[in-house]
């Protein structure tokens, strides 16, 4: 009987131990994982993170559709509805050229560097070739009668503009457009002035920078959030809080991201701080990661949002701050008439659409989203959509807007930048992140259900025993 | 070097007419545009008249509409200002001027212009 | 027409001081304000432009502060070259218009 009983005794023991170990395994795993983490996210050399920071391992697409107008006679003769039509994807591989000037400063734990900019193009993934032609405004007819609109200097314009035979709309070629053009009308300005024109010029062979961020090293819930920006903690656009530079630049956030998190990131093209708030749960080839969107609440009037009041800059085209759904960053593009959207003016206030037709804005398209892995941190794969537009206003002494009777906020284009972890970084993250901690998760539950159910049953088994043995 | 010269100043009767000259150097009238400002004797500067970039439109005070008009030639990079029927109260030194921006950067030396019996 | 008023009509001041000439827009000129320096049989000579840009080779004791409808020169150390009349002229609207000029004298 006593082997028996000692032999029970010993399996619910052993059950016992197993379950203890299981149970006291998963803190301890919990704080083995969050060490192996912390150590790993760290920006310097010789983490993962660092690796992957450096040089991004995914390839970043960046899609644009043009805003090609069908009917400019019509909007400069008659100030008629400009009607569009989109054309693309025309894509360009960029975001494929390592940080530069990386140095880190021990002192305050910050690592500061310049993001090389480069846009290669991709035929392949996109309908036509940069050699395609669009009628869009005329980019710098518009500029210039925004920047100068003293009626003397536009009398002087207008001179120029007929001169060079300008008109408010022109035909660009699709590189002339996005990387720039030397423009007639502001090559006959007799100053240095630069004539060059372009959405995006100059950028091949620019930087955005420089970026300070902290390294991690003294706190992990700091690690890439920026501390400093060209210098500075603030961007001298807006006015109070609007004008900081708040979190991360969405590459990755600080680790073990909850969904209650606002997660904060800054944007050098829209020359704002901005958040996103979780939506849902996505499995990205076999990664658990946290769906963040930018809400349309981003993007709402000081009316509906009291938050957003130190983005509305002026009161005239905003209707005295009532309009919504577009960001006019002047002050950060040399004063001219920039203004950001959501693709299609998604979120937008119906009085920003009125004047544009053949506009079809959908989420599912035209909405903005960061897929994050929760444990790291890192952004595993984004959609950044936005829209670039320029305000043309009538000017009774130049002779292309003369006719116009009201204000036009012009779609030029939206671009969709897109990035997923490759398939081998995906299987790599999974066997060295995901697999790790579904492992030893796997290991503490087998342990835990083990040891309960052969305690249980062994105690079961030997009391069973004694009853009889009593009897 | 930018230099403005002007002539054709002198002594004139009422309702008699006379053509200024400025002749510019250093750089083309036609880009930049040219302005007459004249200062009566111990007074003022009072703007005139001027001609906007490429030959484009041109302007006048007030005080000489339909009587002044000024006019350039691009292949001598001269600017005129003819001025018909002329007052006593024309009597001034007129200069040249030239600007982009509304402001005269350079100016030529005058020229006295006197409308008197 | 934009009328522009200036004070004081003339001023006297010794050298090494300093000095403020005002200039009154009838109506908004935002930045597009000039000041002339002109001396007695010489053609004026452009000092500043938008209110506040000195023109290169103007020495950088001569500022100009304002927008809207109030603008300053000022001259912070007065020099002898510096006797002279100052006039602002508004270049935001045609017809272009002048102050009736201030003159700087020696005390």
């Known amino acids: 009987g006593c082997d028996r009983n000692c032999g029970l005794i010993t399996g619910a023991v052993i059950g016992a131990v197993l379950a203890v170990f299981g149970g006291i395994l998963m803190p301890v795993g919990d704080m083995l994982i969050q060490k192996t983490i912390k150590k790993e996210v760290v920006l310097e050399e010789g983490t993962i993170a660092f690796k992957n920071w450096v040089k991004t391992g995914t390839e970043i697409y960046r899609q644009f559709w043009i805003f090609d107008v069908q009917n400019p006679q019509e909007v400069m003769m008659n100030s008629s509805n400009i009607q569009v039509k989109q054309r693309g994807p025309y894509t360009y591989r960029v975001r494929f050229l390592a940080k530069e000037n990386i140095t880190q400063d021990p002192k305050d734990n910050t690592v500061s560097f310049l993001q090389p900019n480069g846009a290669i193009f991709e035929p392949s993934l996109s309908v036509g070739t940069e050699a395609d032609n669009f009628t869009v405004l005329n980019l710098a007819v518009a500029a210039a009668s925004h920047i100068y609109p003293n009626p003397f200097v536009q009398v002087v314009l207008n001179s120029l503009i007929n001169k060079s035979k300008s008109s408010m709309f022109q035909v660009r070629t699709l590189r002339e457009l996005l990387w720039g053009y030397t423009d007639p009308f502001l090559s006959l300005v007799p100053y240095p002035v630069s004539t060059r024109v372009g959405m995006f010029y100059p950028y091949n062979n620019t930087a955005d920078g420089v970026y300070k961020v902290f390294n991690g090293k003294d706190s992990i819930s700091k690690v890439a959030i920026i501390d400093t920006y060209k210098g500075k903690r603030n961007l001298s656009y807006w006015e109070s809080y609007c004008d900081m530079i708040n979190g991360t630049d969405a590459a990755s956030f600080p680790p073990f991201v909850e969904k209650s998190q606002v997660l904060q990131f800054f944007s050098s093209d829209i020359c704002r701080s901005i958040y996103a708030v979780f939506e849902s749960d996505v499995n990205l080839k076999g990664i658990p990661v946290y769906r963040f969107v930018l809400p349309s609440k981003a993007f709402a009037s000081p009316v509906q949002n009291p938050d957003n009041h130190c983005f509305c800059t002026e009161k005239i085209i905003s209707k005295n701050c009532t309009s919504y759904g577009v960001l006019d960053i002047s002050k950060c593009k040399e004063g001219k008439p920039v203004y950001i959207s959501l693709p299609h003016f998604l979120y937008a206030s119906p009085d920003v659409s009125e004047t544009i037709d053949g506009l079809n804005p959908n989420e599912e398209e035209h909405r903005t989203y960061l897929d994050i892995e929760p444990i790291t941190g890192f952004t595993l794969q984004f959609a950044k959509r936005l829209q670039v537009n320029l305000l043309v206003k009538p000017s009774n002494k130049i002779q292309v807007l003369k006719r116009l009777k009201r204000n036009y906020i012009v779609p030029i284009l939206w671009l969709n930048e897109t990035g997923t972890i490759g398939d081998e970084k995906a299987k790599m993250f999974r066997s060295q992140v995901t697999g790790k901690i579904n492992l030893l998760g796997l290991i503490e539950m087998i342990l835990l259900s083990v040891g309960v159910v052969m305690f249980v049953a062994f105690m079961i088994s030997y009391c069973a025993c004694r009853s009889k043995t009593i009897k | 070097e930018v230099q403005l010269v002007e002539s054709g100043g002198g002594l004139v009767q009422p309702g008699g007419s006379l053509r200024l000259s400025c002749a510019a150097s250093?750089?083309?009238?036609?880009?930049?545009?040219i302005h007459w400002v004249r200062q009566a004797p111990g007074k003022g500067l009072e703007w005139v008249a001027w001609?906007?970039?490429?030959?484009?439109?041109?302007y006048y005070a007030d005080s000489v509409k339909g009587r002044f008009t000024i006019s350039a030639d691009t292949s001598k990079n001269t600017a005129y200002l003819q001025m018909n029927s002329l007052r006593a109260e024309d009597t001034a030194v007129y200069y040249c001027a030239r600007s982009f921006f509304g402001y005269f950067d350079y100016w030529g030396q005058g020229t006295l212009v006197t409308v008197s019996s | 027409d934009i009328q522009m008023t200036q004070s004081p009509s003339s001023l006297s001041a010794s050298v090494g001081d300093r000095v403020t000439i005002t200039c009154r827009a009838s109506q908004d000129v935002s930045n597009w304000v000039a000041w002339y320096q002109q001396k007695p049989g010489k053609a004026p000579k452009l000092l500043i432009s938008y209110a506040t840009s000195l023109y290169s080779g103007v020495p950088s004791r001569f500022s100009g502060s304002g927008s809207g409808t109030d603008f300053t020169l000022t001259i912070s150390s007065l020099q002898p070259e510096d006797f002279a009349t100052y006039y602002c002229q508004q270049h935001s609207n045609a017809p272009l218009t002048f102050g009736q000029g201030t003159k700087v004298e020696i005390k």
């Open positions: 001609i906007a970039p490429y030959g484009g439109d041109t």
């Open positions: 250093g750089f083309t009238i036609s880009s930049f545009g």
